[in-house]
């Protein structure tokens, strides 16, 4: 039994790090392998992660960790019974993949504006809480070409867009993901998408008399 692709890990900078690797053949990860991880200098015993299968020869392990401190460094030992297959280290702050935002909601009660809001996935005392920026993806279910990305570079987890920028009378979906420049993170996974019907109709009178003013909104 050998490791074909060495473990690579990402941290959510909160409580979970996820490590993935590939073996040289089909493996029952949970019964044959154990990933031991220990904070460097920690005097208590190493923690054990029981991996799950991730495809035939792939394994994935979710390492439960304490709050991350930027200097944290972990040793990783991959064991098959009494055989040490691989030894490495992992610094969570250098491999951050933020948690996905949640609770994405589209508020359509303001006649000419769509307000999208979502929740920051971190508690206020986590360093990433004030360092996330977002990308919002909106697309039409009817027209695959109608696909747009809005970059939200301010801290507030919300986006306002003019309803008139979307086609009227059709259904749209939206999703949001996050990243943090300070730790040069990867993007988070996308949030679950939410669907709404864009029923915005620009009244003829308003369009006629306030056309210029409308485009300044």
């Amino acid at each position: 039994m050998k490791v074909l692709q060495e473990p690579t890990c990402v941290s959510d900078y909160m409580s979970i790090s996820t490590c993935e690797w590939k073996m040289n053949g089909p493996t029952n990860c949970s019964t044959e392998l154990r990933l031991l991880y220990q904070l460097v200098f920690l005097l208590s015993e190493a923690h054990t992660c029981i991996p799950e299968n991730n495809g035939g020869a792939g394994c994935v392990c979710h390492l439960l960790m304490d709050d991350v401190v930027s200097a944290d460094n972990y040793t990783l030992d991959l064991w098959a019974g009494q055989q040490l297959l691989w030894k490495g280290s992992f610094k969570p702050s250098e491999h951050v993949k933020p948690r996905a935002p949640g609770n994405l909601t589209v508020h359509t009660n303001v006649s000419d504006t769509l307000l999208l809001t979502w929740s920051n996935p971190y508690p206020p005392d986590n360093y990433l809480y004030n360092h996330l920026t977002y990308a919002v993806n909106i697309w039409s279910e009817n027209d695959p070409a109608d696909f747009r990305i809005y970059n939200v570079t301010y801290l507030e987890p919300s986006l306002r867009i003019a309803a008139s920028t979307l086609k009227s009378g059709i259904s749209y979906r939206a999703r949001v993901r996050a990243w943090a420049q300070c730790y040069n993170t990867t993007w988070s996974e996308w949030s679950p998408s939410t669907k709404w019907h864009n029923s915005y109709r620009e009244p003829f009178e308003q369009h006629h008399h306030h056309h210029h003013h409308h485009h300044h909104h």
Partner: antibody
Framework: EVQLVESGGGLVQPGGSLKLSCAAS????????MSWVRQTPDKRLELVAT????????SYPDSVKGRFTISRDNAKNTLYLQMSSLKSEDTAMFYC????????????WGQGTSVTVSS | DIQMTQSPASLSASVGETVTITCRTS??????LAWYQQKQGKSPQFLVY???TLAEGVPSRFSGSGSGTQFSLNINSLQSEDFGSYYC??????????FGGGTKLEIK
Amino acid sequence: EVQLVESGGGLVQPGGSLKLSCAASGFTFSTYGMSWVRQTPDKRLELVATINSNGGSTSYPDSVKGRFTISRDNAKNTLYLQMSSLKSEDTAMFYCARFFRFRNAMDYWGQGTSVTVSS
Amino acid sequence: DIQMTQSPASLSASVGETVTITCRTSENIYSYLAWYQQKQGKSPQFLVYNAKTLAEGVPSRFSGSGSGTQFSLNINSLQSEDFGSYYCQHYYGPPTWTFGGGTKLEIK
């Protein structure tokens, strides 16, 4: 309930020896790092010895190095501190403490045992 | 060894007041700092770790903050059971970890 109970303290003459014990219960002793911390009469705290979960790694500050030895018996759930060549400045309350599972902070402390070094 | 400077050495306050105790380190310890409370005649009790995370069962009127070399422990709306001594301790790097000199919090 986590419990740490120290014993073995007492009055000893300068140059003498003493062995402290700490009986642990209420947790899986063999998975935790342990330490001895002393509190001097002026109420200062000093970490005097640490040991990792399997007993394979120990550490001491310069003030006690070569005179104090920390050890553990995981089968008996007991931590020890062997002290020799004792000096008057070793007079203190000695606490046994458990290291937190994720960090090297001490989450549980015993009630302490008093050591007085005097002629 | 890293030096820990705790201040003030003592302070008096009344029930209901807010107090702040500070701890300064001689070098960067990131957030590897713990706080302990010790009541008269008792052993120290674990309060805070990673500079800001409350230990299990610690009331929310306690809060820790800081990183690098400057840290503080805040106690909002002091209760009678909060009086005693407080100590900071760093656990950065190999085990040559040191404590601050302590702060004695007394009833005014």
